[in-house]
């Protein structure tokens, strides 16, 4: 469902991935240098950034975000 | 800098209704949301409600649902937490505090109130 | 309403030691936590957000871990003036809810 509209609540932010606001609605997520092998599942459709440097992703599927805008 | 200054304390009487407010200044008023937490004496935070100065949009702890009402006024940047038909249990310290992205960054002082016959 | 529980209530450590604070959320909040320090007679301050994110200006001893249910707060090595109250609060969904605190005090 929507998330509900809160000044209070805290966006998803990936397990041991590093987030930081970015105004009011949008989110900032570093996930570099985590040896991920795969793309975050939880990823936020209000993600504004991802930082996915340093890691051990070797291939991309077609549209591999389509929950992001 | 960023300051939010409450107003002073008070006391009550069962049944009566406290006006609270949270003058803000050193940031722009309509950017940020407004929280409304309590700590009654010995225990720990708890959350009343929130509104966004934008455009007066609120969400309310159910608990309270009824009995608090949040308003802003966006011309002096001060927001209001009323709350009605009091009781022992609402002696507290009332904070406003600000948020942005779901976190609380800046609080004010807190307000006491004492609720007693 | 998602319920925050914190352990211990009360820590007694001495300045230079390392503190854990625990918090634990009664169901998955998705790393959506904060902490806050409070302290008589002061204004309460963030510390953490996002369950690792580290407020403006508050020292690198300070730092969040945990994932799912259970959040740990770290001071790597406590200076005089840490010793205060904690809280954690979530912020996964409305009504967002406390710990009941916990109390670092000088051993």
């Known amino acids: 469902g929507s998330s509900p509209r809160s000044g209070v609540l805290l966006r998803g932010c990936p397990t041991h991935c590093h987030c930081e606001p970015d105004g009011r609605m949008l989110l900032r997520v570093d996930c570099s240098d985590l040896g991920l092998s795969e793309l975050p599942s939880n990823l936020s459709v209000f993600t504004s950034y991802l930082d996915l440097s340093m890691n051990n992703i070797s291939q991309l599927l077609p549209n591999p975000l389509p929950s992001l805008r | 800098q960023v300051q939010l200054v409450q107003s002073g304390a008070e006391v009550k009487k069962p049944g009566a209704s406290v006006k609270v407010s949270c003058k803000a200044s050193g940031y722009t008023f309509t950017n940020y949301w407004m929280q409304w937490v309590r700590q009654a004496p010995g225990q720990g935070l708890e959350w009343i409600g929130e509104?966004?100065?934008?455009?007066?949009?609120?969400n309310y702890n159910q608990k309270f649902q009824g009995r608090v009402t949040l308003t802003v006024d966006t011309s002096t940047s001060t927001a209001y937490m009323e709350l009605s038909s009091l009781r022992s249990e609402d002696t507290a310290v009332y904070y406003c505090?600000?948020?942005?992205?779901?976190?609380?960054?800046?609080w004010g002082q807190g307000t006491t109130v004492t609720v007693s016959s | 309403e998602i319920v925050m529980t914190q352990s211990p209530a009360t820590l007694s450590l001495s300045p230079g030691e390392r503190a854990t604070l625990s918090c634990r959320a009664s169901?998955?909040?998705?790393?959506?936590l904060n902490w806050y320090q409070q302290k008589p007679g002061q204004a309460v301050r963030l510390l953490i957000s996002y369950r690792s994110r580290r407020h403006t200006g508050i020292p690198a001893r300070f730092s969040g871990s945990g994932s799912g249910t259970d959040y740990t707060l770290t001071i790597s090595s406590l200076e005089p003036e840490d010793f205060a109250v904690y809280y954690c609060q979530q912020g996964n969904s409305l009504p967002p809810t406390f710990g009941g605190g916990t109390k670092l005090e000088i051993k």
């Open positions: 169901q998955d909040i998705s790393n959506r």
């Open positions: 509104i966004d100065p934008s455009d007066s949009y609120t």
């Open positions: 505090a600000r948020s942005l992205s779901g976190y609380v960054d800046y």
